[in-house]
Amino acid sequence: CKAMHVAQPAVVLASSRGIASFVCEYASPGKATEVRVTVLRQADSQVTEVCAATYMMGNELTFLDDSICTGTSSGNQVNLTIQGLRAMDTGLYICKVELMYPPPYYLGIGNGTQIYVIDPEPCPDSDF
């Protein structure tokens, strides 16, 4: 398989609502029309798949209905949003891009985005 460069930010801080967004950019060597984007989480040397979507260039990026990810694509950039994150989900989130069509097949894996998630403090009871 042919290698391809994928860039993503080094660090992202999730919002207080547990939402993290980052851009995954790939250096496409040609005009790909079918692209598969996968987000992987690496923690304690274990890698798990968070979500994946295949999109036809020019169409929306569609994840499965029960996915915690949403995203949009623009050219060689994919804007990814992961929601429902909690402190225990802190880890390295790796963007993997595969150019499925036309041949040849290309695979690109980013260095990962360290997403930090801080659970919000519960609001103290206020006496009035």
Partner: nanobody
């Protein structure tokens, strides 16, 4: 490890037809590009046809209009229907699955099936 097993090759006369099958030991079509390659004696292995998870199909110029690639997800099998065969189609035909599992690229090959077009 996924196993790819080709069948359907043989000796056929020019103008004849053959259907090659490639049976996979698991459901790999949803994630991988499935392709048929061929290698003639003394030549390099070339892509003949491929089909993606999204259903996009590619054909080499030399086989367009004569060969048809298809897949059956229920049977975990990909096919290559070859019509109007020519002597220059003589080669060993290989099934290939290309993609990735987590962080690892995969590139599985079958053992190959011989196709000989001769009168």
């Amino acid at each position: 490890e996924v196993q790819l097993v080709e069948s359907g090759g043989g000796l056929v006369q020019p103008g004849g037809s053959l259907r090659l099958s490639c049976a996979a030991s698991g459901n790999i079509f949803t994630r991988n590009v499935m392709g048929w390659y061929r290698q003639a004696p003394g030549k390099q292995r070339d892509l003949v046809a491929s089909i993606t998870p999204g259903g996009n199909i590619y054909y080499a110029d030399s086989v367009k209009g004569r060969f048809t690639i298809s897949r059956d997800g229920a049977k975990n099998t990909v096919y290559l229907q070859m019509n109007s065969l020519k002597p220059e189609d003589t080669a060993v035909y290989y099934c290939n699955a290309r993609g990735s599992i987590l962080l690892d690229p995969i590139n599985y090959w079958g053992q190959g099936t011989q196709v000989t077009v001769s009168s």
